[in-house]
């Protein structure tokens, strides 16, 4: 899951192919994390269930001036058929918790890669 | 076997609200989203809204964004969509369905839907 | 909003003969992931709306092999190899690649 190798080719890719290029977004940055990831901070924690995706946007995207997520937010995007925008919560429901960036990204990071292996969701 | 069951037709009057059930039963609830579409006297199919119970995020056609309300209650799987400041051109067949995305997107489809819920409109 | 046209209105079938729906989308729908989210559902008359092909050419289970899915880009067509009469009623295309997901104006199936 780590080596991308080939190159990109032009227009769609596969499914299969967007998350394995997301979780491999993913484990470069917990690879390469050396601080604090965007500077140690807090994000809404989510459940990893249907709907996850959007919801991973809606909180990451609240992480403003952090480089090392910018790449993540962008594919995210493309996971999520809904406009997400930064202060946009979409949740009626008030999140309870919230975690640093660096764990939701290893917990979003642990679940795809689980998705990924059984090739399955519901 | 997957069921969504919907609450009973209705009869407002014009400015009142008004709010629709769905309970499903036969999968788990938190697993797929729900999605509420409205079909008017004679007219096709519109799409209201979108919301996953997992994590309680709603998504609304905006054209029903301030019309409709979309909850859930997790404890019993039940979907719930109120419909405010009701007009005469409100009056439709509401149907929930289930939305079912895939492990690689929350893009999807409607695949199975409730018997629809009657909501009249009228002076 | 992405419109999706069907087209016929209404399609007047001899039992047993085929039939054909097609549907035209003002925008393209494939995602940029490869797949393409156009459906097709059926709606008997009194009766809620019926899943039968997802994702252009996907049967859902249960619904008999005689109603198939193909199109690309833009252009989607359904077809019923052989209709019976419980085939009666009509049939929507929808999309769901764009925001806010929308629906065909529907045809009507009816026998001869």
């Known amino acids: 899951l780590t080596c991308l190798g080939g190159f990109a080719s032009p227009g769609p890719v596969p499914p299969s192919t967007a998350l394995r290029e997301l979780i491999e977004e993913l484990v470069n940055i917990t690879q390469n994390q050396k601080a604090p990831l965007c500077n140690g901070s807090m994000v809404w924690s989510i459940n990893l269930t249907a709907g996850m995706y959007c919801a991973a946007l809606e909180s990451l995207i609240n992480v403003s001036g952090c480089s090392a997520i910018e790449k993540t937010q962008r594919m995210l995007s493309g996971f999520c058929p809904h406009k997400v925008s930064a202060g946009q919560f979409s949740s009626l429901h008030v999140r309870d918790t919230k975690i640093e960036v660096a764990q939701f990204v290893k917990d979003l990071l642990l679940h795809l890669k689980k998705l990924f292996r059984e090739g399955q969701f519901n | 076997e997957v069921q969504l069951v919907q609450s009973g037709a209705e009869v407002k009057k014009p400015g009142a609200s008004v709010k629709v059930s769905c309970k499903a039963s036969g999968y788990t609830f938190t697993t797929y989203g729900v999605s509420w579409v409205r079909q008017a006297p004679g007219q096709g199919l519109e799409w209201i809204g979108e919301i996953y119970p997992g994590n309680y995020n709603t998504y609304y056609n905006e054209k029903f964004r301030g019309k409709a309300t979309m909850t859930t209650d997790t404890s019993t799987s039940t979907a719930y969509m109120e419909l405010r400041s009701l007009r005469s051109d409100d009056t439709a067949v509401y149907y929930c369905s289930r939305w079912r995305t895939s492990y690689f997107s929350d893009y999807g489809y409607f695949d199975y839907w409730g018997q629809g819920t009657t909501v009249t409109v009228s002076s | 909003d992405v419109v999706m046209t069907q087209s016929p209105l209404s399609l007047p079938v001899t039992l047993g003969q085929p039939a054909s729906i097609s549907c035209r989308s003002s925008q393209s729908l494939v995602h940029s992931h490869g797949n393409t989210y156009l459906h097709w559902y059926q709606q008997r008359p009194g009766q809620s709306p019926r899943l039968l092909i997802y994702?252009?050419?996907n049967r859902f289970s249960g619904v008999p092999d005689r109603f198939s899915g193909s199109g690309s880009g833009t252009d989607f067509t359904l077809k019923i190899s052989r209709v019976e009469a419980e085939d009666v009623g009509v049939y929507y295309c929808?999309?769901?690649?764009?925001?806010?997901?929308?629906f065909g104006g529907g045809t009507k199936v009816e026998i001869k």
């Open positions: 929808s999309q769901s690649t764009h925001v806010p997901y929308t």
């Open positions: 994702t252009v050419s």
